[in-house]
Every structure is written in C-alpha cells, then in structure tokens.
C-alpha cells in the first residue's frame, strides 16, 4: 500500500479468482484513543472500533472511503483505491490502446518544434468518475524538470456504438535548448483513477522522435506564361524552430486529381517553391519534415489548381 | 564543363552524404543486431566527444546565444581552417566550430576503425561497418582540414568479446548519428550565412 496523495492510498493486488488479497491497517488521524468507530462510504454499518482498523482487501467492494468517527463527529478519512496486477502486468482498463506507432501505445505525444514544448493525448471510453494527473521529467535516475499543465478533455467522437473521449496535456521542459543533442529521454507519467480503480501509464521518448511540424503556410500558385506549369510557393510554419537555416525543413509537393484513384505526382525539395503541372480539377498539397532527421511529416497544406 | 563547387557547398553535400550513409548503417545495425537491443530506446546514450570537443557550444547559431539553456556547456577548442569556410568568413567562432567538428569526426573515425578491426577478427561476420560511411567521414574530414596534415590515429586494440564489441558499435552509431544531424544543421547554417 502506498500514498497517492493526502488521505488517498493505493492497494496493489495480485488479481485472480480466490486471491487472498492484502491485509491493510488503517489508522485514524486523531489524538483520541477510544470511542472510535469505522464506516465505509455512505454505509452506517460499523466495521470496527478503535484507533486502527484491520481489513482484508480482496476486491472493489473492499475499496472506498473509510471514515473514523467519534460520537457522530468525523475524525478522518482514508480513500482506498485498487491497482490490479494481472499475471505480473498492471491492468490497463481505463485507457484505449491506440496501436500507433505500435501495440500497447496508450499515450501519444507530439512536438511542433525543438523548444521543449510537447503535447500528449490519450483515449478512453469512460465518461464519468475519471481523473488524471500528469508528471514528466527528463531522465529518471537524476530527473530534470518538465512542467505539465492539467489534463483536459480535448475531443469527443463516436466510434461505432461507443463514444470515445480524448484527453490531452501540454508540457514544457524547464530549461530546453533547441540545439541540444538529447541523450536522456523525456518520461511522461499519467495517473488515472476511475471510481476506485487506479492505473498508471508511462511513455518515454526523445523530442526529436516526436517532432511533427505544422503544415507549410502561405501556400500560393503562380501560373507560368504559355505553360500548364505553375510555380508553387510556401513558407515555413510560424511554429517551427528558428533559425530556419539551422533547423531546416524538407518538403513534399503532391499533385492530386479529384479522384483518389488518379496517380499522384510527387516532388521532394528543400526549397520553398517548386514547379509542377497543374491538371484541371486537381489540387496541390505540400507537407514538411525535418530535413536531417526522419520524424513525422506535417499534415498537408492544400490549394486547388483552378 | 566542370562546375567548381565552392568550399561550403562541398562540405554541405559531403555532410548530407555522411548523413545518408550513417542513417543506412544505423538501420542495418538495428536489423542485424536486433537481439542486442540496438534501438535508441534500449541503449545507453554515450557521447564519446563529451568533455573532448565543444561542437554544440561553438557551433551554436547566433540567434540561440540569448537562450541561457544553450550556453551551459563546456570549453575545449581546436582550430582547423579547411575548405569549408569561404575566405571572407573566417570568424573565430566559425573556425572553432569547424575545428570541433573535425575533432568529433576524428574521434569517431578512430573508434569505428577499432571496432571494424575487432569485427573482422570474429569469424562469424554478422555485421561490419559500411565502407560508404567510413569514406564519407574521411572525405568530410579532408575538406575540414584540407591544408592540415591527415592524422591517422592508430586504432586501439580491438575488444575481444564479440557481444561487447557489438554493443559498443550500437552505442557509438546512435551517438554518431545524432552528432551527424548536428553537423548537417551547422553546415546548412554556415552555408546560408
């Protein structure tokens, strides 16, 4: 058993049918010595008396808010949460496996640049009685500071019969140098509590691996005289790290016909312009990627050919 | 007709070539040494140039000098004045920066040569270093030190234990590929200056 926060405790249980559970001793936080009684949640049934209460915690019916009283007055509370260990592996009931980029990905994180600021998000089908708390650091043995905000509900979507809820959090490394070479990964830890169930999720990454630039901005077309060709030009996104000559991007320019089946023409360039043939009803899209490190491509910025 | 490639442009294309060959080598190592946990998540990241060179500090873009977090690095310097700098741009900072990159490459070259020797001593040649990467290191070093002497350091005696040699190769390759990205950023920055 360990303390999650003041008066909230997590009991770790080896979870299998007929498991003996864990013996837990609760102590009433009071100078009083006698006349103390204990109850669980809203029930008025007295579970025991005395300054300490010994309970065998086996299942969720044994978890909850234990309260000690004296003569009708509440002395203190202890909330017991359960953390299930199923065959040596902590349960992951609360969050959905996003399966991207690989199985068992519960937390996904992205950064728009090398400033040390990043966003993480996760999915759940649970709509109520749910709380999250997020901590982060650079490295784990001698951790350096990363400050995270509060997790917020950022999207809701319907998937088949289920509603899916997306939560996200923004974090900022306290003293980040965009030009630094990372040798210790960022660690992100999310505590999730649903009703009386506690779970924790972690992700470990280098900022360089979660970079996803914003799409190029100011995408423009300039028709070339007496030709079906156009000059496409664009600019680096505002959110990208500066100077651009150091934090350079490379670009992919795509000409896509109206039908998804039509052959796509693609050009790769390090410049912020390209000459392409603009077909009728086609659109031109450009996306960006770090020039020297193969992290994610940005989303496409698009303009119609006409 | 032959179009002469100016110094900085040549260094830029050489560093791009080094980036490509290094990336290929990392992919090969990750695949061939998958039982040695040769992925970025699994290895300890060890910078052999730490406390020996000061590439990150001396090559820091001027625009980042106001960021205090970027300046908290260590001092050591070496001066080489190769063909990567156009004659009119010989600021001390640039010279120190390219000198530091040269020192990085020299240290990695020495380590890679030692590892290659050790790998070739082992009968089952599960992996050897890609010649393209070693040539790319050499070419960029020559451009950085074109009027200096070529220093061929004698590689240290190869590690005997094949497992440890392969683990060391993994660690070195990951650290080197990270430094090669920095070198490319620097060359891009200098050639646009």
């Amino acid at each position: 058993i360990w303390e999650l926060k003041k008066d909230v405790y997590v009991v770790e249980l080896d979870w299998y049918p007929d498991a003996p559970g864990e013996m837990v001793v609760l102590t009433c936080d009071t100078p009083e010595e006698d006349g103390i009684t204990w109850t669980l949640d809203q029930s008025s049934e007295v579970l025991g008396s005395g300054k300490t209460l010994t309970i065998q915690v086996k299942e969720f019916g044994d978890a909850g808010q234990y309260t000690c009283h004296k003569g009708g007055e509440v002395l203190s509370h202890s909330l017991l949460l359960l953390h299930k260990k199923e065959d040596g592996i902590w349960s992951t009931d609360i969050l959905k496996d996003q399966k991207e980029p690989k199985n068992k990905t519960f937390l996904r994180c992205e950064a728009k640049n090398y400033s040390g600021r990043f966003t993480c998000w996760w999915l759940t089908t649970i709509s109520t009685d749910l709380t999250f708390s997020v901590k982060s650091s650079r490295g784990s043995s001698d951790p350096q500071g990363v400050t995270c905000g509060a997790a917020t509900l950022s999207a809701e979507r319907v998937r088949g019969d289920n509603k899916e809820y997306e939560y996200s959090v923004e974090c900022q490394e306290d003293s980040a140098c965009p030009a630094a070479e990372e040798s210790l990964p960022i660690e992100v830890m999310v505590d999730a509590v649903h009703k009386l169930k506690y779970e924790n999720y972690t992700s470990s990454f280098f900022i360089r691996d979660i970079i996803k630039p914003d799409p190029p901005k100011n995408l423009q077309l300039k028709p070339l005289k007496n030709s079906r060709q156009v000059e496409v030009s664009w600019e680096y996104p505002d959110t990208w790290s500066t100077p651009h000559s150091y934090f350079s991007l490379t670009f992919c320019v795509q000409v896509q016909g109206k039908s998804k089946r039509e052959k796509k023409d693609r050009v790769f360039t390090d410049k912020t312009s390209a000459t392409v043939i603009c077909r009728k009803n086609a659109s031109i899209s450009v996306r960006a990627q770090d020039r020297y490190y193969s992290s994610s491509w940005s989303e496409w910025a698009s303009v119609p050919c006409s | 007709r032959v179009i002469p490639v100016s110094g900085p442009a040549r260094c830029l294309s050489q560093s791009r070539n080094l980036l490509k060959t290094t990336d290929d080598m990392v992919k090969t190592a990750r695949e061939k040494l998958k039982h040695y946990s040769c992925t970025a998540e699994d290895i300890d990241h060890e910078d052999i140039t730490r406390d020996q060179t000061s590439t990150l500090k001396t090559c820091l873009p001027l625009e980042l000098h106001k960021n205090e977090s970027c300046l908290a690095t260590r001092e050591t310097s070496s001066t080489t004045r190769g063909s990567c700098l156009p004659p009119q741009k010989t600021s001390l900072m640039m010279t120190l920066c390219l000198g530091s990159i040269y020192e990085d490459l020299k240290m990695y070259q020495t380590e890679f040569q030692a590892i290659n020797a050790a790998l070739q001593n082992h009968n089952h040649q599960q992996i050897i270093l890609d010649k393209g990467m070693l040539v790319a290191i050499d070419e960029l070093m020559q451009s950085l030190n074109h009027n200096g002497e070529t220093l061929r350091q004698k590689p240290p005696v190869g590690e005997a234990d094949p497992y440890r040699v392969k683990m060391k190769l993994c660690i070195l390759l990951h650290a080197f590929s990270t430094r090669v990205v920095t070198i490319n950023r620097v060359m891009g920055y200098l050639s646009s200056a």
Partner: antibody, heavy 115, light 112 residues
Framework: QVQLVESGGGVVQPGRSLRLSCAAS????????MHWVRQAPGKGLEWVAF????????YYADSVKGRFTISRDNSKNTLYLQMNSLRAEDTAVYYC????????WGQGTMVTVSS | QSVLTQPPSVSGAPGQRVTISCSGS????????VKWYQQLPGTAPKLLIY???QRPSGVPDRFSGSKSGTSASLAITGLQAEDEADYYC????????????FGTGTKVTVLG
C-alpha cells in the same frame, strides 16, 4: 471453490459452425479476464482468444481471427466461443481458463472437424 | 508456431535432477514473467510455477523455476515416476499481451 466447465464440443463438418460454452462458478466471474486455449491431438498448447472482464476488449490468435468470436454473459457467469468456417486444423481439445498469476482451467471439450 | 523454444524431451532416472529450458527474446521472457505447467495425459494443464520462481500451494518443492535474461528454466530434483508428463512454459510478449505465448513443450520421461 473455482470451477470451470466447458461444453458444446462435438464432430462437425468443415465450413460449419459450433459454439462452445464455459460455465464458471465459485468466484466473481465479472471481475476477471478469460481465455480460450486449445490443444490439437498430440500437439502443444495454443492460445486462441481473450476477453476482458467487462467484454470491452477481445483479442484473437491470427489463426482464428475473423472466424472465431469470444464473448461473455456476466449475468449468466458464462464464457462463449463462437466458431465459424471451421477447418480440419481447428480439431482440438478446447479449454477455458481464468486470467491471472494463479489460473484455473476447465476439463476441456473436444472439437473434431472432419468430413 | 511457438516463439518460446523448449527441448522436445528430457529424461532421467528416479531420484535424479532434470532441467527444462525455455528460450525466448527480449520482448517476451525478457520483459515478462514466466509460468510453468505440467500436463498429465488426458488432463488439463496444472500450474507448477508462476512469477518465474513462485510455487502455488500444493506443488512439491522438488519443482523450482528460474529466469535469466531471455530464457527460463524448470528444475525437477528427486525425479519421481509420477513426474512423467509434458511440461510447458508460458509468457507474454510486450506488444501482443494478453495473448498467451506457450513453449513448444517438453516430454519428461522417468527411466527404469
């Protein structure tokens, strides 16, 4: 006392369907994940499928994906395996088992797929 | 096919010590715990070892398990006639959990 009893096995022709049941007793069935495991005659153990305690997530072996469906009815304390498009290689003893460090197995039910 | 490899058979005289190995990789045994089962002919598997080296109550202390790196082993000391059975190791893969990974199985024969 935890008990699992499988039923529903038998002889079936290739391409046909069969539904296996596993009746659970002696524990809070709705709190635990459940597996189906099979064993072809003279062969080793092969995992088939898993279902979470609340039925929210299901996982399948590649060899049965798209043909078999695992489900549970917590109100009836019963686990099911719906087997469609059966093949000769599905011939095996099918066991249900609880998920956890100390697991409980049923006695198994034989499924024979033969023309 | 199974990704946990066991020897097809081992044998020993009564009273002897035999060991069965179970070889995996970093993503399965290297990252997860190992169980061992005994299966007598015509019966369901019976749990012998869980969490690499723990014995459930009722399992004789002649059976012991261990794990090192990406492999595990089961040792049977003081071999007895009733130990003649098939033995299976089981673990998980970190990317496919909760799919059960079983070993290929080892037939233990008690000689004489």
């Amino acid at each position: 006392q935890v008990q699992l009893v499988e039923s529903g096995g038998g002889v079936v022709q290739p391409g046909r369907s069969l539904r296996l049941s596993c009746a659970a007793s002696g524990f809070t069935f709705s709190s635990y994940g459940m597996h189906w495991v099979r064993q072809a005659p003279g062969k080793g153990l092969e995992w088939v499928a898993f279902i979470r305690y609340d039925g929210s997530n299901k996982y399948y072996a590649d060899s049965v994906k798209g043909r078999f469906t695992i489900s549970r009815d917590n109100s009836k304390n019963t686990l099911y395996l719906q087997m469609n498009s059966l093949r000769a290689e599905d011939t095996a003893v099918y066991y249900c088992k609880t998920h956890g460090s100390h697991d409980n197995w049923g006695q198994g039910t034989m499924v024979t797929v033969s023309s | 096919q199974s990704v946990l490899t066991q020897p097809p058979s081992v044998s020993g005289a009564p009273g002897q010590r035999v060991t069965i190995s179970c070889s995996g990789s970093r993503s399965n045994i290297g990252s997860n715990t190992v169980k061992w089962y005994q299966q007598l002919p015509g019966t369901a598997p019976k749990l012998l070892i869980y969490y690499n080296d723990q014995r459930p109550s009722g399992v004789p202390d002649r059976f012991s398990g261990s794990k090192s790196g990406t492999s595990a082993s089961l040792a049977i000391t003081g071999l007895q006639a009733e130990d003649e059975a098939d033995y299976y190791c089981q673990s998980y893969d970190r990317y496919t959990h909760p799919a059960l990974l079983f070993g290929t199985g080892t037939k233990v024969t008690v000689l004489g």
